[in-house]
């Protein structure tokens, strides 16, 4: 499996000047070398990938991952059973649906097996880390001479998602954006029949069921107008 590590948010401070600082009790040693951060994402509540930047280690190290849920029936420490690899070094762990409990505090521990004191424990709110699949089955229908309605589907509980619709014409340099709540439909009240329109949608697990910051991928675009809309003025859902 290839893993995708989302790039850090431009924090130049994250790995510099570590040895200029004092630790509270221990003298500086291998065990105080900082471990890479673990970043987890829950994909459509079907599986979760927790990944780390294995190349940040001073030498190639197969770090191990354990996890548990704080204060729950699932608080037994679990070993990662499905590691992800980057150049034959562990760089992540994949958890399956049955191991995901969105509304319990997820505790993840990364450890250097050669130096057991070298470990880092993080806590995560999984409901804020859900990334839904891109919206599918975009369709357009003409409500009136100048009004279009865009509909789409999500492979998830619809009430948990908010959406962002973007559209533009061939004449536009940039997209126009419109936020849409869980209703997953969007109306464009004023359509110019002489222009060709392109629409696309993405979705986010927010705000009713979680507070995720990351959007899904964009849907495939759908087009309306110019020559093609004359073929069927009432329904047109050809994807690019």
């Amino acid at each position: 499996l290839n893993t995708t590590i989302l790039t850090p948010n431009g924090n130049e401070d994250a790995t510099t000047d570590f040895f200029l600082t004092s630790m509270p009790t221990d003298s500086l040693s291998v065990s105080t070398l900082p471990l890479p951060e673990v970043q987890c994402f829950v994909f459509n509540v079907e599986y979760m990938n927790c990944t780390w930047n294995s190349s940040s280690e001073p030498q190639p190290t197969n770090l191990t991952l354990h996890y548990w849920y704080k204060n729950s029936d699932n608080d037994k420490v679990q070993k990662c059973s499905h590691y992800l690899f980057s150049e034959e070094i562990t760089s992540g762990c994949q958890l399956q649906k049955k191991e995901i409990h969105l509304y319990q505090t997820f505790v993840v521990q990364l450890q250097d097996p050669r130096e057991p004191r070298r470990q880092a424990t993080q806590m995560l709110k999984l409901q804020n880390l859900v990334i839904p699949w891109a919206p599918e089955n975009l369709t357009l229908r003409k409500l009136s001479e100048s009004q279009l309605e865009l509909n789409w589907n999500n492979r998830f509980l619809n009430h948990c998602l908010e959406h962002l619709v973007q559209y533009r014409t061939d004449w536009d340099h940039s997209w126009t954006e419109q936020s849409v709540d869980y209703r997953h439909k969007f109306s464009l009240p004023s359509v110019d029949g002489q222009k060709r329109y392109t629409f696309r949608v993405r979705s986010r697990f927010n705000p009713l069921c979680g507070s995720a910051q990351h959007w899904s991928e964009w849907s495939h675009p759908i087009h309306w107008g110019s020559n093609s809309s004359k073929e069927n003025p009432f329904l047109f859902a050809l994807e690019a």
Epitope: N9, T21, V38, C40
Partner: nanobody, 126 residues
Framework: QVQLVESGGGLVQAGGSLRLSCAAS????????MGWFRQAPGKEREYVAI???????FYADSVEGRFTFSRDNAKNEVYLQMNSLQPEDTAVYYC????????????????????WGQGTQVTVSS
């Protein structure tokens, strides 16, 4: 280099409140995971409250519902509001910070923090 200075500790009766402050200089805390830890005599240092810069906060079981973590990025300070204090809360309280790349990173392990304050004593009498 970040310097962290705690204040607000003291002697308080059981059931009372204190508000600890941690002022940072040298760097902005806006992209730091922050934590409050405590160490009682003869015991290991333990986390009390931890926070990612994305705003996810977690509390130790023993303080949940009584203590509240907050941060003021404009003032470059973090706080720990401690209510319904109990004698078992007596300890030296430390503020700690770690620059992180991800908004969701909140560390409960003390060795993950790069910067530490000198500590402030909290004593709760019965």
């Amino acid at each position: 280099q970040v310097q962290l200075v705690e204040s607000g500790g003291g002697l308080v009766q059981a059931g009372g409140s204190l508000r600890l402050s941690c002022a940072a200089s040298g760097r902005t805390l806006s992209r730091y995971a922050m934590g409050w830890f405590r160490q009682a005599p003869g015991k290991e240092r333990e986390y009390v409250a931890i926070d990612s810069w994305g705003g996810d906060t977690f509390y130790a079981d023993s303080v949940e519902g009584r203590f509240t973590f907050s941060r003021d990025n404009a003032k470059n300070e973090v706080y720990l509001q401690m209510n319904s204090l109990q004698p078992e809360d007596t300890a030296v309280y430390y503020c700690a910070g770690a620059p992180t790349s991800f908004a969701t990173t909140a560390y409960s392990s003390s060795n993950s923090y790069r910067y530490w304050g000198q500590g402030t004593q909290v004593t709760v009498s019965s």
